[in-house]
């Protein structure tokens, strides 16, 4: 057969109108002409092309091809001639000040912040060579130089990740109901009930020893023990398996003896054996139909014509002559569009193709990173290149703790709290914000001073009942919180001075809340009877439900602003899922009763998702794209609840529309709230008033009663008819259609006044609930009965 790539020298053939005819008479899509790829394979599609000059930000390959400058010397050849990775190009490269050279034998530069971070980013590990000990005196330094609390050493778990914390340990004593394999010789510990059960569980088979079991051990003689029924096969390792499992290709015995000494697969006399060992009826051999999975029943039957010799079989790329007919195929990175023509595969359609940015090219794709991140050339994931090392901050009811994700050292940020569940941070100001459910207050402090009660500032302590979710808008300097007792969502300035209730209707059990100040949206979870995840503008307009099906107890939610996805954990379904910011492209990443036994908080950073689990009393992490690589970050935590990542890349800077306006605070008398950026015509912000006041006709000033002139001039999305309902004492209800910036009725006091004591619900263990139990039965009692607040755990 002729070379399938070159095509035949048969009669000339005209190409379709949207195709280009190569000199060798091949037809290629016209758009491939002058794209710097030799698609014709005789270079005729690249002849007579206008000369291309590379941009200043590009690298010019030796053959004139242009590639991004940052792809030069990155370990992958992007130039067709490989000149971007050549010795000549790369040895000239000097690493800039903020980068570290990987040594004289390498031309690779890595961010200086990756030096001594416990991960080998240079091929030879030069970035981790000669690093000083980082660990505190009470910590253990792992072989990979991460730090570990001393209590984790020799505890039977590989906490370091390289096994170094479990090397050279004295043999631990077996538990009270455990058996030591190999006598006292330091073997494994196995449950006592596994001893003398006719199955070898110890490597040395000591759990089935004759002297121990009072009978010949199943492996004591060369002959295996007889099985109970004739329909069973006796494994050499002692166990009995179904006789039908013998020689079935599956290893069912521990020692695989059910697949030993098996005859080679042969077909019956009236059958044909395919190349892969399967059998088909002999009459199907050479019947011009492919019956064997590998097509071998039709191999060697006909010596017919080679269609590939004529116009390459009509294939745009590769033509393969078959015994019957022919087949068009494509090179890597291309797919058949119409059985003959190859088109580029858009690998970027797969949202998980890259950890951040995916750029599709003809025949291949390339991953890139957002500013502030750099590609780790070993894992191909984007890693933070700027700023201090990221840390994970979490609450455990009585404390706020911090774990450095690079050094892995573990510290207490705020001790001696009463009942803290929700928290968030403001990275630029180094402040931490948290809610205490027992004291019914929202606090703030500088992180380095937060352990001192005198430095803890009370921001909100009025009309709070059960503030279970908290989020900081670091751009517009606001805090948002959910209150499951009052059934409200509120906003306040970060100093607590000005506040407003945004939502007080259609909330059942609001819990987690997250904000996207770059686009002007907030997101929250509600684990009430109609559990859902909702979204609205940061000013309370354009409320919409994103998830309402296959959702039961959504606890934590978090946003990945870069990939524009929302992640959440569901503690009833034991799932970790994600959706895009519009509620589409839903994915369940992990479904596990083990790792997601009772998840509560969730956070995302780089290529990982982190979550807390109340039942496991641990923090887990996994790959955020596929849910794989699940590992435990910390355990024995006693009620770990909310969790956030502290790193400057988690809170990118953006313009504050309220401060950019001609008038300070957007000209608003009270609150200036960012509006959702739905289109280029969206307003940048809207003004808001306290719960007892109304916006005036100028939409900026606040008045005690609606200004009569303004009732009909307002945006319909904001207009609401205020119903005549029973209100808190002293509140006026105005029966008129009037725009009060929020989508809600203004109210003076919270739905449950802070002076009212709420009866305590009994503490019910989740495991005792029947499937029909209402979500609301799942309470965990607040320790401070005087306050009368029940904190409910979805």
């Amino acid at each position: 057969a002729a070379d399938p790539l070159l095509g035949g020298q048969g009669p000339a053939k005209d190409c379709e109108k949207d195709q280009f005819q190569c000199r060798n008479e091949r037809c290629i899509p016209s758009v491939w002409r002058c794209d710097e790829d030799d698609d014709c394979l005789d270079h005729s599609d690249e002849d007579d092309c206008p000369k291309k000059t590379c941009a200043d930000s590009d690298f010019t390959c030796d053959n004139g091809h242009c590639i991004h400058e940052r792809w030069k010397c990155d370990g992958e050849e992007e130039c067709p001639d490989g000149s971007d990775e050549s010795e000549a190009t790369c040895t000239k490269q000097v690493c800039p000040a903020e980068k570290l050279s990987c040594g004289p034998t390498s031309h690779k530069c890595v961010p200086a912040s990756w030096r001594c971070d416990g991960e080998k980013d240079c091929e030879g590990g030069a970035d981790e060579a000669g690093c000083a000990t980082l660990c505190a005196p009470h910590e253990f330094q792992c072989g990979n130089r991460s730090c570990l609390a001393a209590v984790f050493v020799c505890d039977g778990d590989d906490d370091c990740g390289d096994g170094s914390d479990e090397r050279g340990c004295a043999d631990p004593a077996c538990g009270p109901r455990e058996f030591r394999c190999g006598g006292d010789g330091g073997g494994a510990c196995i449950p006592e009930r596994w001893v003398c059960d006719r199955q070898f569980d110890c490597e040395d088979r000591s759990d089935e020893a004759a002297e121990l079991c009072g009978r010949p051990g199943p492996g004591a003689t060369s002959a295996p023990a007889a099985c109970a029924t004739a329909s069973q096969f006796a494994c050499r390792s002692g166990e009995c398996v179904h006789l039908g499992w013998r020689c079935d290709g599956d290893r069912d015995c521990k020692d695989k003896s059910d697949e030993a000494d098996c005859p080679l697969g042969t077909c019956r006399g009236d059958e044909f054996q395919c190349g892969d060992g399967t059998c088909v009826l002999a009459i199907k051999h050479c019947n011009q139909e492919q019956d064997c999975p590998d097509g071998s029943d039709e191999a060697g039957c006909l010596q017919g014509l080679n269609e590939c010799l004529h116009n390459n079989g009509g294939c745009s790329h590769i033509c393969t002559d078959l015994k019957i007919g022919f087949e068009c195929t494509c090179p890597a990175g291309f797919q058949l569009l119409d059985q003959k023509t190859c088109g580029d595969i858009d690998e970027c359609k797969d949202p998980d193709a890259c950890s951040q940015i995916c750029v599709n090219y003809k025949g291949y794709f390339k991953c890139e990173c957002y500013p502030g991140y750099e590609m780790d050339l070993l894992t191909k994931n984007c890693k933070a290149a700027a700023g201090k090392s990221p840390s994970l901050i979490f609450t455990n009811r009585h404390e706020v703790r911090r774990i450095d994700l690079v050094k892995r050292n573990y510290s207490r940020l705020i001790p001696m709290l009463k009942n803290v569940v929700a928290l968030d941070v403001e990275v630029a100001t180094n402040r931490i914000y948290w809610c205490d459910l027992s004291y019914r207050k929202i606090y703030s402090a500088y992180m380095d001073k937060a352990s001192d009660p005198k430095e803890q500032e009370v921001l909100i302590d009025e009309q709070l009942h059960s503030p279970e979710g908290l989020a900081v808008d670091w751009v517009h300097k606001h805090i948002y919180w959910t209150d499951s007792g009052n059934k409200t969502i509120s906003v306040a300035t970060v100093d607590g001075g000005r506040r407003r209730t945004l939502f007080s209707r259609n909330l059942s059990e609001p819990r987690a809340i997250a904000v996207d100040p770059l686009r002007g949206f907030m997101y929250w979870s509600d684990w009430g009877d109609q559990a859902k995840i909702e979204k609205s503008g940061l000013n309370g307009v354009d409320r919409q439900t994103l998830v309402s099906d296959n959702i039961e107890w959504p606890n934590g939610i978090t946003l990945d602003l870069l990939s524009q996805r929302l992640y959440w954990v569901d503690s009833k379904l034991h799932q970790l899922s994600s959706i895009d910011f519009s509620g589409g492209n839903r994915k369940t990443l992990i479904s596990s009763t083990d790792f997601l036994s009772h998840p509560f908080g969730i956070a995302v950073f780089e290529d990982k998702v982190f979550w807390t689990d109340l039942e496991n009393e641990a923090i887990f992490s996994a790959n955020r794209l596929n849910g794989l690589e699940i590992s435990i970050l910390a355990e024995n935590l006693n009620n770990p609840h909310d969790i956030v990542i502290f790193h400057e890349l988690k809170q990118p800077r953006a313009p504050d529309a309220c401060e950019l306006s001609v008038q300070p605070n957007g000209g608003c008398e009270y609150l200036c709230l960012p509006a959702p950026q739905i289109s280029s015509h969206s307003p940048k912000y809207t003004c808001a008033c306290p719960d007892t006041m109304w916006l005036g006709p100028d939409m900026k000033r606040c008045y005690r009663a609606p200004q009569s002139t303004s009732t009909t001039t307002l945006a319909s999305t904001m207009t609401r008819t205020v119903p005549a309902t029973t209100r808190a004492p002293g509140t006026t209800v105005h029966r008129s259609t009037y725009q009060n910036h929020s989508t809600e009725t203004p109210s003076l006091t919270a739905a449950v006044p802070s002076s009212v004591s709420v009866p305590r619900a009994p503490s019910i263990s989740p495991s005792t609930l029947s499937p029909a139990t209402s979500n609301h039965s799942q309470h965990y009692a607040n320790e401070d009965s005087k306050m009368g607040s029940t904190v409910t755990a979805a």
């Epitope: 207050k441 009309q463 001075g497 605070n665 008398e669 006041m693 004492p729």
Partner: antibody, heavy 118, light 108 residues
Framework: EVQLVESGGGLVQSGRSLKLSCAAS????????MAWVRQAPKKGLEWVAT????????FYPDSVKGRFTISRDNAKSSLYLQINSLKSEDTATYYC???????????WGRGVMVTVSS | DIQMTQSPPSLPASLGDKVTITCQAS??????IAWYQQKPGKAPRLLIR???TLESDTPSRFSGSGSGRDYSFSISNVESEDFASYYC??????????FGGGTKLELK
């Protein structure tokens, strides 16, 4: 109609203590921050204390911090100001004021005179 | 803390005059300034808030303006009941609350 009526003033010896009261009516007292503002004879106005709606937090300028204590009883719609270690410069008319939702003082009492003698 | 410097301390005027009082803050106060009138032996009365918003019972001859650090209060056509002391107040929802030193409007 909003009404604020102060009481408890008078002539007091330097170094002694005094407790002023303010009775509020005509509005839901428990929904508002309340404050005390004083005015020395022939002088300007000076803010001296503010208390939150529930009474859980209070604020003072540095000039009186440690000596003045503001408190409230929402059940009685009453506001109080305890002044300890009275000094001659505490001689002033003390006004009870309501802090409106937007932050300014929107209603005032008629004031009560405190004179500190040496 | 923010200081409010009010001037002049006293302002002689005749009936029908237009008078202006100024208040300068030690830093930008984002228009959060209120103006009060006080007559001898009486409590202060709120006239203007948020730089220029007149209270519902404030006559229209009173006005306010300003931004940043500099603010002014005017009476366009002085009437006999306007002779009193006037105070500016920088307010916010959190402390401190700072008054200007006051201006006494007197009959010339």
């Amino acid at each position: 109609e909003v009404q604020l009526v102060e009481s408890g003033g008078g002539l007091v010896q330097s170094g002694r203590s005094l407790k002023l009261s303010c009775a509020a009516s005509g509005f839901t007292f428990s929904n508002y921050y309340m404050a005390w503002v004083r005015q020395a004879p022939k002088k300007g106005l000076e803010w001296v204390a503010t208390i939150t709606t529930s009474g859980s937090r209070s604020f003072y300028p540095d000039s009186v911090k440690g000596r003045f204590t503001i408190s409230r009883d929402n059940a009685k719609s009453s506001l109080y100001l305890q002044i300890n270690s009275l000094k001659s410069e505490d001689t002033a008319t003390y006004y009870c004021a309501r802090r409106g939702p937007l932050g300014y003082f929107d209603h005032w009492g008629r004031g009560v005179m405190v004179t500190v003698s040496s | 803390d923010i200081q409010m410097t009010q001037s002049p301390p006293s302002l002689p005027a005749s009936l029908g005059d237009k008078v202006t009082i100024t208040c300068q803050a030690s830093q930008n106060i984002n228009k959060y300034i209120a103006w009060y009138q006080q007559k001898p032996g009486k409590a202060p009365r709120l006239l203007i808030r948020f730089t220029s918003t007149l209270e519902s019972d404030t006559p229209s001859r009173f006005s306010g303006s300003g931004s940043g650090r500099d603010y002014s209060f005017s009476i366009s056509n002085v009437e006999s009941e306007d002779f009193a002391s006037y105070y500016c107040l920088h307010y916010d929802n959190l402390p401190p609350w700072t008054f200007g030193g006051g201006t006494k409007l007197e009959l010339k």
